[in-house]
């Protein structure tokens, strides 16, 4: 089972956490797919980008996403870790100047064009069950993760440990 403990515990700390550097600590390009190996693709339609979850044809090229990793420091009184209470936050950009955003009101994941510094809605706390299998939790809404619903990306509330095993919030990163 995939597990993420303490979803409720650190709600305040997550809201209060700050990105420690303006620059990402690392960046790399990867294709994003679901736990069930469907590809996340991006298409320009009517001057805006749409996000799809779909099976690709055999030789069809996967879309790449630029993952930028940022360190986020918990306030030491919240985390109990002093300087050691660090999280990794990521932003995901499939094309120049566009980033995935959490729309918490609509429970949706959208691509927005924006300039840096990016808004909090573009940052996701990274969780993983292994290096190449990850989940993305909204910085702005702890306990809410990017997930797959009806062949689209959506925001999914994970309210208990049992629900953390759910495959619809798991994504695979790969170079190909």
């Amino acid at each position: 089972a995939f597990g993420i403990s303490g979803v409720q515990k650190y709600t305040r700390a997550l809201h209060d956490s700050s990105i420690t550097g303006i620059s990402p600590i690392t960046e790399y390009l990867a294709s994003l797919s679901t736990y069930n190996d469907q590809s996340i693709t991006f298409a320009l339609e009517d001057e805006s980008y749409e996000i799809y979850v779909e099976d690709l044809k055999k030789d069809e090229k996967k879309d790449k996403v630029l993952l930028s990793y940022y360190e986020s420091q918990h306030p030491s009184n919240e985390s109990g870790d002093g300087v050691d209470g660090k999280m990794l936050m990521v932003t995901l950009s499939p094309t120049k100047d566009f980033w995935l955003h959490a729309n918490n009101k609509e429970h949706s994941v959208e691509l927005h064009k924006c300039e840096k510094p990016l808004p909090d809605q573009a940052f996701f706390v990274l969780h993983n069950m292994h290096s190449n299998c990850v989940s993305f939790e909204c910085k702005t809404d702890p306990g809410v993760f990017i997930g797959v619903k009806d062949n689209h990306l959506a925001l999914i509330k994970v309210d208990s440990s049992e629900n953390l095993c759910t495959e619809n919030i798991l994504f695979k990163l790969s170079e190909t």
Epitope: G3, S5, G6, M87, S131
Partner: antibody, heavy 121, light 106 residues
């Protein structure tokens, strides 16, 4: 201050069992992946096993799969390594380490001082 | 499985020298690479994470670089206290250490 203290090492005969413990303090234990890494005398480092922050996922080096079991008790800030069917090639100093970031399996930010396991008849 | 190969196995240099240690991965590891320092009789210590980020409290003479399969640890001015064995470590796919480079003072 982060502290990791390993205990449970010692001399054991081949085929027997041993359980290592690592007690953690100075950080929010339940938020971090934990690891066991070993080092045979005069040799390099070898990753042995990993456990995610809530204990739901465990990973093992191929040569210890089916013999070693990693577990954790978040209420007691302790991670364990149960070692069964020990072999002479398991002789090493066993280190406990904690992850660098909440919820992710990247980097070993802190290490304990290690406990020596000697498998010999 | 990803293999990590370090070179040289032993490096002998003078105090003040610029020293370069190499680590090669069998596959692209996307900068998911650390460097650890281990002094005789001590536990290893994290120096560099995600290829080029200096761990808190580590002197700035240590730096890391690289991408894809090739990575480097540089000590800009070797000090007597830098005598140790240095291990690279990848966590892009599974967890694997290199065999280590022993750094000595001439």
């Amino acid at each position: 201050e982060v502290q990791l203290v390993e205990t449970g090492g010692g001399l054991v005969q081949p085929g027997r069992s041993l359980k290592l413990s690592c007690v953690a303090s100075g950080f929010t234990f339940s938020n971090y992946w934990m690891y066991w890494i070993r080092q045979a005398p005069g040799m390099g480092l070898e990753w042995v096993s990993s456990i995610n922050n809530d204990g739901g996922n465990t990973y093992y080096l191929d040569s210890v799969k089916g013999r070693f079991t990693i577990s954790r008790n978040n209420a007691e800030n302790t991670v364990y390594l149960q070692m069964n069917s020990l072999r002479s090639e398991d002789t090493a100093t066993y280190y406990c380490a904690k992850g660098h970031y909440y919820y992710t399996s990247y980097s070993f930010a802190y290490w304990g001082q290690g406990t020596l396991v000697t498998v010999s008849s | 499985d990803i293999q990590m190969t370090q070179s040289p196995s032993v490096l002998s240099a003078s105090v003040g020298d610029r020293v370069t240690l190499s680590c090669k991965a069998s596959h692209n590891i996307n900068k998911h690479l650390d460097w650890y320092q281990q002094k005789v009789g001590e536990a290893p210590k994290l120096l560099i994470y995600f290829t080029n980020n200096l761990q808190t409290g580590i002197p700035s003479r240590f730096s890391g670089s690289g991408s894809g399969t090739d990575y480097t640890l540089t000590i800009s001015s070797l000090q007597p206290e830098d005598v140790a064995t240095y291990f690279c470590f990848q966590y892009n796919s599974g967890w694997t250490f290199g065999q280590g480079t022993k750094v000595e003072i001439k």
